[in-house]
Amino acid sequence: VPGEAEQPAPELVEVEVGSTALLKCGLSQSQGNLSHVDWFSVHKEKRTLIFRVRQGQGQSEPGEYEQRLSLQDRGATLALTQVTPQDERIFLCQGKRPRSQEYRIQLRVYKAPEEPNIQVNPLGIPVNSKEPEEVATCVGRNGYPIPQVIWYKNGRPLKEEKNRVHIQSSQTVESSGLYTLQSILKAQLVKEDKDAQFYCELNYRLPSGNHMKESREVTVPVFYPTEKVWLEVEPVGMLKEGDRVEIRCLADGNPPPHFSISKGNPSTREAEEETTNDNGVLVLEPARKEHSGRYECQAWNLDTMISLLSEPQELLVNYVSDVRVSPAAPERQEGSSLTLTCEAESSQDLEFQWLREETDQVLERGPVLQLHDLKREAGGGYRCVASVPSIPGLNRTQLVKLAIFGPPWMAFKERKVWVKENMVLNLSCEASGHPRPTISWNVNGTASEGDQDPQRVLSTLNVLVTPELLETGVECTASNDLGKNTSILFLELVNLTTLTPDSNTTTGLSTSTASPHTRANSTSTERKLPEPESRG
């Protein structure tokens, strides 16, 4: 209309999707009577009457707003509930008297998008790709208006860069009117990006101001060629025979190339391929000294068939050879002397020790053990231990048995055995001597004999307890070329008075009556020998 003042900018009302918008009619009393107002929505420059106010009473017009409008604030404010993105438009109120004036309100609608959903390229990216490859996608669903996406690498925003970084985004409108933003980051990556952290950020606005949401951080599988190959040996440090040793081939490429491990043959001067497991690891278990040598790894790129060779690695499996003792089976008369010599080879300096087998007592530090004025008790085992002090656990031993010539020597001279009449008794008798003695019994029964060692024998006798046996007792006799000796077992009947708590009898009484074959063990379990004069 000519001469009409330019329309003022509409009042801005900002509201979130789903909430209620309060549209306050800003007409002054001079511009119109608020008890007589028409409300319109304006969409694509088309006005639609949506609400009438007459004498302060409101009435919705049929249509999309019919159920969502109500009057507030004594008729000055129109409340629009359950706001949707489609409600983002101009609303105007028009007073009817004294002259038609209107007041315009611009409704702005906002909704925060959902958390951005980032998906990384599951197949990975080669560093030598001809153009930027798809690194990751980012989806921000159900935002309004369209959020802005920013991609980050290691916390720094990524900018479009020709032939290096390209960000492609698109949006779709859902039936709700909300936007779903989709973005894909394309980039040319380098080897150093294998540990890079990527994420996307959605920037959006709400009535309360600007906001942002970040996706989780992702790393991208980056493929790059192998430049260096090397060998690693586990365990680190000095190796010894018997260890489990793993020789592993490693490369700085991704994916790892195909590996083969070979060992130099000193005699042919050629490398021989070793059999590795599925992971390309050569396992030596148990490691032997023959495994010592020079190892190297060859890595093959199966695409280019280019191979790389590692630096050779010397492997030393430390060992101690079998220990040899001379003489190997010494025999000596009482009173004589003996020199025992121990020998062994090793990849390292050796230490020798001589120990008494029965007691583990160290007799000598060194390879030679000298024994003088040999007594009968000197018979038995002597152990030479050859060890490498610098490698714990690397040692070998050899046992030698010294035999002292002499008549049989009984483990006990006499013993009391508690018995019950008519029980089957299991008696045992032990003797030693050189030459090895044999044992006989003075009563009938089932006897069995077993070697304890070359100079010692154990005989067991199963016999029925009879009154006669109780009377006579039992004798065992050990004999060899140099003499004989006897042990006596006295049999005593059990009665209740015998079994007093303070009884210090240590002979083997069986109180079992369930079986007639109860064992009454008369074997001395202690090698504490009586005085020599008590021997027969």
């Epitope: 390229n121 599951p122 001809k130 394309k186 989780r216």
Partner: antibody, heavy 118, light 106 residues
């Protein structure tokens, strides 16, 4: 609209090489990646190989040494070759388009059944 | 490689039933999972992507949920055309599919 169509021999002999072609329409091979997926009779789906929109090739490591995937963007074709075929390779072979803003397959060809038999 | 295990391997149900199919990943795949429907002699068709997003044109009776290692496809009210085999697929590291769940009419 988006379509993908597989073509190639229905029967190959053991040890021979299989060549399959996927002809696409309704989209450009420079905007979407294409994968090959196979399905032996009565069995599950198995991804074989892919070529990205940028032309990078990817293979299932179980078949890697036997596979080659390539494309001809001017003909809108993706070609898969698989050497040293075996009766266990008998399957329906599908080509599938990778969704442009995701990593799943939004359009598939109808598939072609390849039988390996002497 | 990531393994995907579906259960059950087969399932009988009636029209109108609510049906749930589960898929378990051998390691955390976040929400990098899609569900496909395949009918005999036909190619698979994507239903759900990113674990819970409904593909355009797919009826809203289909829904997906889960994250990490455990995922579910739910059909709220079975229709006659829903009887088919359903596959899950991970796209977190490479591509692997579940062994399938055959949904049959009871």
């Amino acid at each position: 609209q988006v379509t993908l169509k597989e073509s190639g021999p229905v029967l190959v002999k053991p040890t021979e090489t299989l060549t399959l072609t996927c002809t696409v329409s309704g989209f450009s091979l420079t905007s979407n990646g294409v994968s090959w997926v196979r399905q032996p009779p009565g069995k599950a789906l198995e991804w074989i190989a892919a070529i990205s929109s940028g032309g990078t090739t990817y293979y299932n490591s179980a078949f890697k040494s036997r596979l080659t995937i390539s494309r001809d963007t001017s003909k809108s074709q993706v070609v898969l070759t698989m050497t040293n075929m075996d009766p266990v390779d008998t399957a329906t072979y599908y080509c599938a388009r990778r969704y442009g803003y995701g990593w799943y397959f939004d359009f598939w060809g109808q598939g072609t059944l390849v039988t390996v038999s002497s | 490689d990531i393994q995907m295990t579906q259960s059950p391997s087969s399932l009988s149900a009636s029209v109108g039933d609510r049906v749930t199919i589960t898929c378990k990943a051998s390691q955390n795949i976040y929400n990098s999972l899609a569900w496909y429907q395949q009918k005999p002699g036909k190619a698979p068709k994507v239903l759900i992507f990113n674990a819970n997003s409904l593909q355009t044109g797919i009826p809203s009776r289909f829904s997906g949920s889960g994250s990490g290692t455990d995922f579910t496809l739910t059909i709220s009210s079975l229709q006659p055309e829903d009887f088919a085999t359903y596959y899950c697929q991970q796209f977190y590291s490479g591509y692997t599919f579940g062994q399938g769940t055959k949904l049959e009419i009871k």
